[in-house]
């Protein structure tokens, strides 16, 4: 299990910027416009534009309320007029440089509209949002805009019983079959497009990946066994001519594995996914947050998957097929029969074109019938190193974003920002042999779940934005200035931070910073370069005989142990003479002349089997 976060920042301790509007709730849709330095926020019955550099500065707002008539009709169907029968913004996607595509639940009558960014007004198009946005604000959803077409995963009907992955397109709309083997009570988590690799084979297609958790069809248990999935469709899909007409011909899905090797610990509920794309990476990496299905202990894990691993399952893996054996417990088994050509579920690539299959519309019926009946792959997608990057106890992770940053020595590190269901943000760096949880920041005053996380990755200014029911919080990627000494700065093992001996401060590293000469940073936590020992100041105290003295010591690191020394000997709390307050401050009882002298408070922190010792406080005590 990962260690506790080294540092804990309370809500008011660090520089967080907040945005919320009284009476507005459910700030669950965030969209960044890097070029405009604007963050768009979709909430209940409202959309806001705020300054991305300081989100407390509101630029625009527009309200999208439900009429009383609609509310009443919704309430007649058994829904709550005060909560469910409102308009929850669920889709907030860029349409052009001057407009956004926005969809809301609209009192169980999902509706979409275009938001003009110049006037910040809706155009009043009121398109049917069915299949693009859920009816029920409690139902899962995901969407991504690809080339002006919305790809969505949501529920298609009022009851929420009909799942759908669709492409909303004027010339070639597509959807999944409404069939249990295709989607079985899915909970949609994330969708994104992966563009064809520039060095990949000619004529490749862009692909859209959907991540969700669904009820297993391949295993039967006494309870509903949930399975995390990745599904994939091709951007160039146009459906079939007869079989799979206006349906995906490229829809395939596979199981995501995230488990601790040689243990029964299986993480099968997908919470969130982030696609890491970075100049130094040869291919995108999917980072995913999981929790176990029976999570009575509060466990969470992060697994990472390479695009190549995912692609290999879809392009070369075996398929599963429904077993019609009566009383069979494994209803789905590996299909070992002949696979039609072209390969079912494959995108139309140069190979297919060479065989005269220029579009999915002229794929042979055998291929289409096969993919219709075999949407599930037998092979599973395994994580990098076949194990989670991080397993954390006593926490329920909700969302993740990942930044790849360069340390002072030129090494690249993946830094994960993972939110919790109690309003906190954990920041963890992936080191060679371990994951170091740098810090935990309480983003929200109340312990409320973080609903959405967004990373702004503009060079020179990077922020994490978190949305919850009550508002949005903007946090810098690091609080370097909070590390008061060189040792603290280095022990943080934060790739964004380095100690500047010139100004005797822990500073934020900017990739384009030129004047970083002489700065100190060591990702192994080696503080031996910290030469400028801070000037030793001390506190002088005078106490009366027989009294009790309390000597303060402030230690921030959760990984360090506080040690008190008197006349160079370590003081133990077991003695009736001494007591500790909060494992930090020292109490000395029944004072006598022998208690006069110098008391030192030190912090001892083990980093990579080495103990780093720091003097935190020095007290000179005189008993009169």
């Amino acid at each position: 299990f990962a260690p506790v976060p080294r540092l804990t920042w309370e809500h008011g301790e660090v520089g967080l910027v907040q945005f919320h509007k009284p009476g507005i709730f459910n700030y669950s849709a965030l969209l960044m416009s890097e070029d405009k330095d604007t963050l768009y926020v979709g909430a209940r019955e409202a959309v806001f534009a705020v300054n991305a550099l300081n989100i407390s500065e509101k630029q625009h707002e527009v309200y999208w309320k439900v009429s009383e008539d609609k509310k009443s009709k919704c309430a007649e169907k058994g829904k709550s007029k005060q909560t469910e029968c409102l308009n929850y913004i669920r889709v907030l996607q860029p349409l052009s440089s001057t407009s956004l595509y926005v969809c809301g639940t609209n009192a169980f009558q999902p509706t979409c509209d275009h938001l003009n960014l110049t006037s910040f007004k809706f155009l009043g198009k009121s398109e049917d949002g069915k299949g693009r946005c859920p009816f029920d604000p409690a139902h899962s959803y995901t969407s991504v805009m690809v080339g002006g077409e919305l790809y969505s995963g949501t529920s298609y009907n009022f009851l929420g019983s009909e799942p759908i992955i669709s492409r909303n397109s004027s010339h070639s709309p597509l959807r999944t079959e409404y069939a249990i083997p295709w989607l079985n009570e899915p909970s949609f988590v994330f969708a994104d497009v992966i563009q064809k690799s520039p060095d990949g084979p000619e004529g490749e297609d862009d692909k859209v990946y959907f991540f969700f958790t669904e009820v297993s069809v391949e295993y039967e248990f006494v309870f509903k066994l949930m399975i995390p999935r990745v599904a994939r469709v091709c951007k160039g899909d146009q459906g079939g001519l007869r079989t799979l007409q206006k349906k995906w011909t490229s829809f395939l899905k596979a199981r995501l594995i995230c488990s601790k090797p040689d243990s029964g610990l299986v993480f099968n509920i997908l919470q969130d996914v982030f696609v890491l794309r970075a100049p130094g990476l040869k291919e995108p990496v999917f980072y995913a947050v999981f929790t176990p299905q029976l999570n009575n202990v509060g466990l969470s894990a992060v697994c990472a998957y390479t695009l190549a691993t995912v692609e290999a399952v879809f392009s070369r893996g075996k398929y599963m097929q429904s077993a019609t054996v009566e009383q069979s417990h494994t209803k789905w088994v590996r299909y070992n029969g002949p696979v039609p050509t072209p390969r079912p579920g494959a995108c139309i690539d140069s190979e297919a074109r060479a065989a005269n299959y220029t579009s999915s519309l002229n794929l042979p019926d055998k291929t289409l019938q096969f993919v219709k009946d075999h949407p599930l792959m037998d092979d599973s997608v395994t994580p990098i190193d076949n194990r989670p990057k991080l397993i954390k106890k006593d926490v329920n992770y909700t969302q993740i974003v990942v930044d790849r940053t360069q340390a002072l020595d030129g090494t690249f590190y993946d830094v994960m920002f993972i939110s919790t269901d109690r309003g906190a943000l954990h920041k963890a760096v992936i080191l060679t042999k371990e994951v170091h949880v740098i810090e935990e920041t309480q983003l929200f005053r109340d312990s409320e779940p973080v609903l959405t996380l967004l990373l702004s990755s503009k060079k020179g200014r990077k922020f994490v934005y978190a949305g919850s029911n009550s508002g949005v919080v903007q946090a810098p990627l690091a609080f370097c200035e909070k590390h008061g000494s060189c040792e603290d700065c280095v022990l943080a093992r934060d790739p964004y931070c380095a100690w500047s001996p010139a100004i005797k401060a822990c500073v934020t590293l900017h990739q384009e910073e030129a004047s970083s000469r002489g700065w100190i940073q060591d990702m192994s936590g080696d503080t031996s370069s910290c030469l400028d020992k801070s000037k030793e100041s001390f506190n002088q105290h005078f106490f009366k005989h027989g009294g009790t003295a309390e000597l303060k010591c402030f230690q921030k690191s959760n990984l360090a142990r506080v040690v008190w020394k008197f006349q160079n000997g370590e003081l133990k709390a077991a003695s009736p003479k001494y007591g500790f307050v909060g494992r930090k401050h020292l109490l000395i009882f029944n004072l006598s002349d022998g208690d006069s002298g110098v008391y030192q408070c030190l912090s001892e922190e083990r980093v990579r089997n080495k103990t780093v010792s720091q003097l935190l406080a020095k007290h000179v005590l005189e008993v009169k």
Partner: antibody
Framework: QVQLVQSGAEVKKPGSSVKVSCKAS????????MHWVRQAPGQGLEWMGQ????????SYNQKFKGKATITVDKSTSTAYMELSSLRSEDTAVYYC???????????WGQGTTVTVSS | DIVMTQSPDSLAVSLGERATINCKAS??????????MNWYQQKPGQPPKLLIY???NLESGVPDRFSGSGSGTDFTLTISSLQAEDVAVYYC?????????FGQGTKLEIK
């Protein structure tokens, strides 16, 4: 071949309950949603609700919420519909029907007549 | 709920003649170019039988004298040449939006 065989006719007293069964054969039971439709004497067809046999997740027409309970037993490939607090207006023929990919009822049970009379 | 209204309520057509039944939905039953409208035939003492799905697709095993057309809110079932065995009640049904609803039925008889 694909078949849905329903239980026999029932005569029930007002206030009582009845459980109608629908046994599927000739196809993979868990791969298709099962729906229930009712037809009152001399009347048209009314959709009551559906069930996902894999998960047991049922959803109902608002009109029949609290009246009908749909369940499945995967081990016997059987769907059930229980009607509670029976009244004379519940007298009808009840059909189970398989919901196919194209969003239509392609196979129907033969129907079960439930008569509610004192 | 979407209300389906069939016309006429009953229809008498001579053998070999064309029979046309209309169905009007209170709101569109289309989604992204697909019409979720189905037609069923029910004979006395029997369950309904699927004839046409998705407005115009003929169910396998159904004679090709049956055809369906229409989109949006207006749909038609046509029997090109009525046969004696076609005497039955015909129902339209939408599956675009729950609750799924049926028309009141059209009784087709021989003139």
């Amino acid at each position: 071949q694909v078949q849905l065989v329903q239980s026999g006719a029932e005569v029930k007293k007002p206030g009582s309950s009845v459980k109608v069964s629908c046994k599927a054969s000739g196809y993979s039971f868990s791969d298709y949603y099962m729906h229930w439709v009712r037809q009152a004497p001399g009347q048209g067809l009314e959709w009551m609700g559906q069930i996902n046999p894999t998960t047991g997740g049922a959803s109902y027409n608002q009109k029949f919420k609290g009246k009908a309970t749909i369940t499945v037993d995967k081990s016997t490939s059987t769907a059930y519909m229980e009607l509670s607090s029976l009244r004379s207006e519940d007298t009808a023929v009840y059909y189970c029907a398989r919901y196919y990919y194209g969003r239509h009822f392609d196979v129907w049970g033969q129907g079960t007549t439930v008569t509610v009379s004192s | 709920d979407i209300v389906m209204t069939q016309s006429p309520d009953s229809l008498a057509v001579s053998l070999g003649e064309r029979a046309t039944i209309n169905c009007k939905a209170s709101q569109s039953v289309d989604y992204d170019g697909d019409s979720y409208m189905n037609w069923y035939q029910q004979k006395p003492g029997q369950p309904p039988k699927l004839l046409i799905y998705a407005a115009s697709n003929l169910e396998s095993g159904v004679p090709d004298r049956f055809s369906g057309s229409g989109s949006g809110t207006d749909f038609t079932l046509t029997i090109s040449s009525l046969q004696a065995e076609d005497v039955a009640v015909y129902y339209c049904q939408q599956s675009n939006e729950d609750p799924y609803t049926f028309g009141q039925g059209t009784k087709l008889e021989i003139k």
